[in-house]
């Protein structure tokens, strides 16, 4: 039985040109995390394999930094980065857990005026 839960940063916003940390945390399970995939819609951003380390997709290699931990840092944000991001935890023996983060990238002036999503 899958007992674990994924905690994420929920809905977040960031300034155009800035950076953001995408972070998920798996709790309430003793399952071993073998791999975490970071995906956006149909695109693979990165994979962190517990043994082999990080794989960064070439289309993101200049804008993505591994970590902290199993998280992912997105840099040089553009408005096109707005959207859903998924952390997919591959675990043994439980199987797969998926967390969702919604990122909105705002023009600097808007971000400076404090427009923020509430984290549920």
């Amino acid at each position: 039985m899958m007992t674990g839960t994924i905690e994420t940063t929920g809905n977040i916003s960031a300034e155009k040109g800035g950076s953001i940390i995408l972070q998920c945390h798996l709790s309430s399970t003793t399952a071993q995390v073998t791999q975490v995939n970071w995906e956006q819609q149909d695109q693979l951003l990165a994979i962190c394999n517990a043994d082999l380390g990080w794989h960064i997709s070439p289309s993101f290699k200049d804008r993505v930094a591994p970590g902290p931990g199993l998280g992912l840092t997105l840099q040089s944000l553009t408005v096109n980065d707005t959207g859903e991001y998924f952390c997919i935890y591959h675990t043994y023996p439980d199987g797969t857990y998926t967390g969702r983060i919604f990122l909105e990238v705002l023009e600097s002036s808007v971000a400076e005026h404090g427009a923020r999503f509430q984290i549920p």
Partner: antibody, heavy 119, light 107 residues
């Protein structure tokens, strides 16, 4: 120039063990994963496992777990694969292959080592 | 484990022909697919990584495309040195797996 040079061909009896070496040069050994791949005569490619030298992380294909042991010697920039309890179906060419930088595909390969298991 | 099925298994073609090989994954692997060329008695050589990126020094007659479960490898105009066996590989999850190979022969 990146180079992966493997040890020579081996002939072994069933039940024995074999240890293949892969001596590397031309890059920072600890920064790249080393994969091992099997190719039986006239057959396709089969991933045995991979090892990350900087932290010693190893991922094995379950099919080979328990019989294959991947190790490295960071002082000589050499990777090793030992295969135990050999049987006839282990007769194959074994390749070491360097994982590309921050990727899992393999961009440089050794020349291969033929292991023949025969009584 | 993720299965990769290549088609065709073998193919006869002539110099100058356009050749396409397909690779179908048993589950979604996003773009985590590489293509290798292997000549008899030699080690495989990386041609394409992450589905569509040419490796350094690979001629632009070689190309790759696809995402999800369906991938395509194309040689736009066959050269004599291209006759070899080609393999796709997924690196979305371990154990990394290869297709069974496609042998490209001279017609």
């Amino acid at each position: 120039e990146v180079q992966l040079v493997q040890s020579g061909a081996e002939v072994k009896k069933p039940g024995a063990s074999v240890k293949i070496s892969c001596k590397t040069s031309g890059y920072t050994f600890t920064e790249f994963t080393m994969h091992w791949v099997k190719q039986a005569p006239g057959k396709g490619l089969e991933w045995i496992g991979g090892l990350k030298p900087d932290n010693g992380g190893i991922s094995y294909n379950q099919k080979f777990k328990g019989r294959a042991t991947l190790t490295v010697d960071k002082s000589t920039n050499t990777a090793y694969m030992e295969l135990s309890s050999l049987r006839s179906e282990d007769t194959a060419v074994y390749y070491c292959a360097r994982g590309a930088y921050y990727r899992y595909d393999a961009d440089y390969w050794g020349q291969g080592t033929l292991v023949t298991v025969s009584s | 484990d993720i299965q990769l099925t290549q088609s065709p298994s073998s193919l006869s073609a002539s110099v100058g022909d356009r050749v396409t090989i397909t690779c179908k994954a048993s589950q979604d692997v996003k773009t985590a697919v590489a293509w290798y060329q292997q000549k008899p008695g030699k080690a495989p050589k990386l041609l394409i990584y992450s589905a569509s990126y040419r490796n350094t020094g690979v001629p632009d007659r070689f190309s790759g495309s696809g995402s999800g479960t369906d991938f395509t490898f194309t040689i736009s105009s066959l050269q004599p040195e291209d006759f070899a066996t080609y393999y796709c590989q997924q690196h979305y999850s371990t154990p990394f797996t290869f297709g069974q190979g496609t042998k490209l022969e001279i017609k």
